[in-house]
Interface confidence: medium
């Protein structure tokens, strides 16, 4: 069984205020079973940005069809970016359980927000 890797290829992404940011994340294995979640920041103060199993998350859409069982692309698009969205975003795989437990994290993608062009 292939070891799960969580691939966040962008070390950083820069987006102008008001635009959408695409944050890439793919996984290399369907195991263990469990959802993908996106967070901004790390540690106890981190903020949930997207959870595959709950919602809605009005500004967040998935780039591919995450409901398909064989899907391995969990990239997200965040619309109408504001300076408050700046930070490092982590794509994290959880192992299914009661409750789900964090299994593995991507390396993170730092989102910086540029001033809206005048």
């Amino acid at each position: 069984e292939e070891e799960l890797q969580i691939i966040q290829p962008d070390k950083s992404v820069s987006v102008a205020a008001g635009e959408s940011a695409i944050l890439h994340c793919t996984i290399t294995s369907l195991f263990p079973v469990g959802p993908i979640q996106w967070f901004r920041g790390a540690g106890p103060a981190r903020v949930l940005i997207y959870n595959q199993r709950q919602g809605p998350f009005p500004r967040v859409t998935t780039v591919s069809e995450t409901t398909k069982r064989e899907n391995m692309d969990f990239s997200i698009s965040i619309s109408n970016i504001t300076p408050a969205d700046a930070g490092t975003y982590y794509c994290i795989k959880f192992r299914k359980g009661s409750p789900d437990t964090e299994f593995k994290s991507g390396a993170g993608t730092e989102l910086s927000v540029r001033a809206k062009p005048s």
Epitope: I7, P9, D10, K11, S12, H24, T26, T28
Partner: antibody, heavy 119, light 108 residues
Framework: DVQLVESGGGVVRPGESLRLSCAAS????????MNWVRQAPGEGLEWVSL????????YYADSVKGRFTISRDNSKNTLYLQMNSLRAEDTAVYYC????????????WGLGTLVTVSS | ETVLTQSPGTLTLSPGERATLSCRAS??????LAWYQEKPGQAPRLLIY???SRATGVPDRFSGSGSGTEFTLTISSLQSEDFAVYYC??????????FGGGTKVEIK
């Protein structure tokens, strides 16, 4: 100017060990992920290993996993590759390569150091 | 692991001619693709990143195009210093970071 200078190559017998070094200058070494890439005689480029700027994240190619160890000393601006249990197929020029700060491509390379494994 | 296939293996052309090098990925790498030039006794040199962005100091006769699985490096008018081996590298699916097998551009 960014400079990467590899050293430590040489001729060894199968099963022996070698430690390669890469001295870096011209950039803030600790801020950049670093890689080793090799090229066997007459062959293409093969990625070997990656280490993050802090040294906390490390990856290896399957072909060297368990035999090679990448490390870095940020106080000395130096990258290392400890190569154990060397095999004939490890014969190659080993390049030290600096990653771009945003993406995982290599914006600067050293000239390489030749490792020959032969009985 | 994403496999990159470069073609042709060797391209034999005269100075002034146009060179078109191909790199095909076994799965989509979006535009996370770089091209390098390698000459004997020299360090490999980054030419193109992001499939189409020229690295600093690279002459504008070098251009890259493509996305997904099909990529092209074009040298619009070959100069004597362009005869070398060229490699593509994907940096979307990692580890491992993978390279193509290379295309040698040699003088006719």
């Amino acid at each position: 100017d960014v400079q990467l200078v590899e050293s430590g190559g040489g001729v060894v017998r199968p099963g022996e060990s070698l430690r390669l070094s890469c001295a870096a200058s011209g950039f803030t070494f600790s801020s950049y992920d670093m890689n080793w890439v090799r090229q066997a005689p007459g062959e293409g480029l093969e990625w070997v290993s990656l280490i993050s700027g802090s040294g906390e994240i490390i990856y290896y190619a399957d072909s060297v996993k368990g035999r090679f160890t990448i490390s870095r000393d940020n106080s000395k601006n130096t990258l290392y590759l400890q190569m154990n249990s060397l095999r004939a197929e490890d014969t190659a020029v080993y390049y030290c390569a600096k990653e771009n700060n945003r993406y995982r491509f290599f914006d600067y390379w050293g000239l390489g150091t030749l490792v020959t494994v032969s009985s | 692991e994403t496999v990159l296939t470069q073609s042709p293996g060797t391209l034999t052309l005269s100075p002034g001619e146009r060179a078109t090098l191909s790199c095909r990925a076994s799965q989509s790498v979006y535009t996370y693709l770089a091209w390098y030039q390698e000459k004997p006794g020299q360090a490999p040199r980054l030419l193109i990143y992001g499939a189409s962005s020229r690295a600093t100091g690279v002459p504008d006769r070098f251009s890259g195009s493509g996305s997904g699985t099909e990529f092209t490096l074009t040298i619009s008018s070959l100069q004597s210093e362009d005869f070398a081996v060229y490699y593509c590298q994907q940096y979307y699916d990692r580890p491992p970071l993978t390279f193509g097998g290379g295309t040698k551009v040699e003088i006719k």
